[in-house]
Interface confidence: medium
């Protein structure tokens, strides 16, 4: 005979656990239904009645199957200089990220408290390490035989073109100039770019089975450009 399907609430067999999307209620000592994402437990279960769930109110959410008494608050509204990459819904927190070309320089668990513009490497310097969501660009001087003639947070040092006859030797900030009509080898025209970091700020997710901390959102401090660092400019 097939095993009888138990309907919540039910007392679990000794040593067994509750099924998926159920939780064990210590007070009722029964397996009871969890509430679906976008809902919360309005009334906890008893020995004779199952969990009563209710929809999350505006500006609150639950991301997982849960039995929390109230939904979690969505994070603060994104500031004017931030990008809202995920809206606050009943099932997910708002996510704010630093706008393109910026990175998070000061953060807490709630998210980014300070977005700062990515450092730009000035001519004669190239990007040694590209910026990420949480780290600035690192610039390095162009080594002999390479140059960068741009002020950029993405351009690396490029090799000088090799001439049959050099009219003007290249330096760290300028390519070589050839006298012949066609150099022996030249780079493809245009600067070499490193990809911009893509903002995909990870969020703190609800722990299970005891949700105690809210997923975070990110925040921006509007600010001016960074002062120049060695080999960089804040322009």
């Amino acid at each position: 005979l097939p095993a009888q399907v138990a309907f919540t609430p039910y007392a679990p067999e000794p040593g067994s656990t509750c099924r998926l999307r159920e939780y064990y209620d210590q007070t009722a000592q029964m397996c009871c239904s969890k509430c679906s994402p976008g809902q919360h437990a309005k009334v906890f279960c008893t020995k004779t009645s199952d969990t009563v769930c209710d929809s999350c109110e505006d500006s609150t959410y639950t991301q997982l199957w849960n039995w929390v008494p109230e939904c979690l608050s969505c994070g603060s509204r994104c500031s004017s200089d931030q990008v809202e990459t995920q809206a606050c819904t009943r099932e997910q927190n708002r996510i704010c990220t630093c706008r393109p070309g910026w990175y998070c320089a000061l953060s807490k668990q709630e998210g980014c408290r300070l977005c700062a513009p990515l450092r730009k490497c000035r001519p004669g310097f190239g990007v040694a390490r590209p910026g990420t969501e949480t780290s600035d660009v690192v610039c390095k001087p162009c080594a002999p035989g390479t140059f960068s003639n741009t002020t950029s947070s993405t351009d690396i040092c490029r090799p000088h073109q090799i001439c049959n006859v050099v009219a003007i030797p290249g330096n760290a900030s300028m390519d070589a100039v050839c006298t012949s009509t066609s150099p022996t080898r030249s780079m493809a025209p245009g600067a070499v770019h490193l990809p911009q970091p893509v903002s995909t700020r990870s969020q703190h997710t609800q722990p299970t089975p005891e949700p105690s901390t809210a997923p975070s959102t990110s925040f921006l401090l509007p600010m001016g450009p960074s002062p120049p660092a060695e080999g960089s400019t804040g322009d």
Epitope: A116, L221, S226
Partner: antibody, heavy 120, light 111 residues
Framework: QVQLQQSGAELARPGTSVKLSCKAS????????IDWVKQRTGQGLEWIGE????????YYNEKFKGKATLTADKSSSTAYMQLSSLTSEDSAVYFC?????????????WGQGTSVTVSS | DIVLTQSPASLAVSLGQRATISCRAS??????????MHWYQQIPGQPPKLLIY???NLESGIPARFSGSGARTDFTLTIDPVGAVDVATYYC?????????FGGGTKLEIE
Amino acid sequence: QVQLQQSGAELARPGTSVKLSCKASGYTFTDDYIDWVKQRTGQGLEWIGEIYPGSGNTYYNEKFKGKATLTADKSSSTAYMQLSSLTSEDSAVYFCARSQVYGKIAMDHWGQGTSVTVSS
Amino acid sequence: DIVLTQSPASLAVSLGQRATISCRASESVDNSGNSFMHWYQQIPGQPPKLLIYRASNLESGIPARFSGSGARTDFTLTIDPVGAVDVATYYCQQSKEDPYTFGGGTKLEIE
């Protein structure tokens, strides 16, 4: 306008606990931090910790871990600080203050303070 | 922890003159071109009041005779000209990292 209203003065016996309250109004309570600061008579200011009411996340000065417990009630826009195992060293004025998550990142509005006296 | 050292501990200035208070941090409180140093005024019997945030920004409603300057580890609060209502204790505070810390305070008096 932003206001933080703190509970009245407390007289407590050594070894007991007190729970101070700080009711916020004039802004979205869950959007910013509530900080707590201690000031002993004639002394300077000491940061105890802060709570983000939106999530309940707390940050403590190591010196006050085990002494202070910060909580918040979103429904009443009230932050609480419980001080336990009181000694004479805990006699002080305790301030709550708001600190914006972004912007100033400073304590721009303060409660009037709650005086706690520990005496047998 | 970042230690903030204020000097002088007390200061007597004539009305209309300039008062300068210094705050030195044990390590830099700068991050990406911002200095996370703030200045507060506390009149006896009252809570502190924010005067200057992030080193040099004047808080709304604070008179322009208050100004802040500095970067990294050395910061200054200037009151020019000093008025009778400025008698108070002034504190610097950093919020670059937990635990947030305050300076020991500078008591301003009128001579």
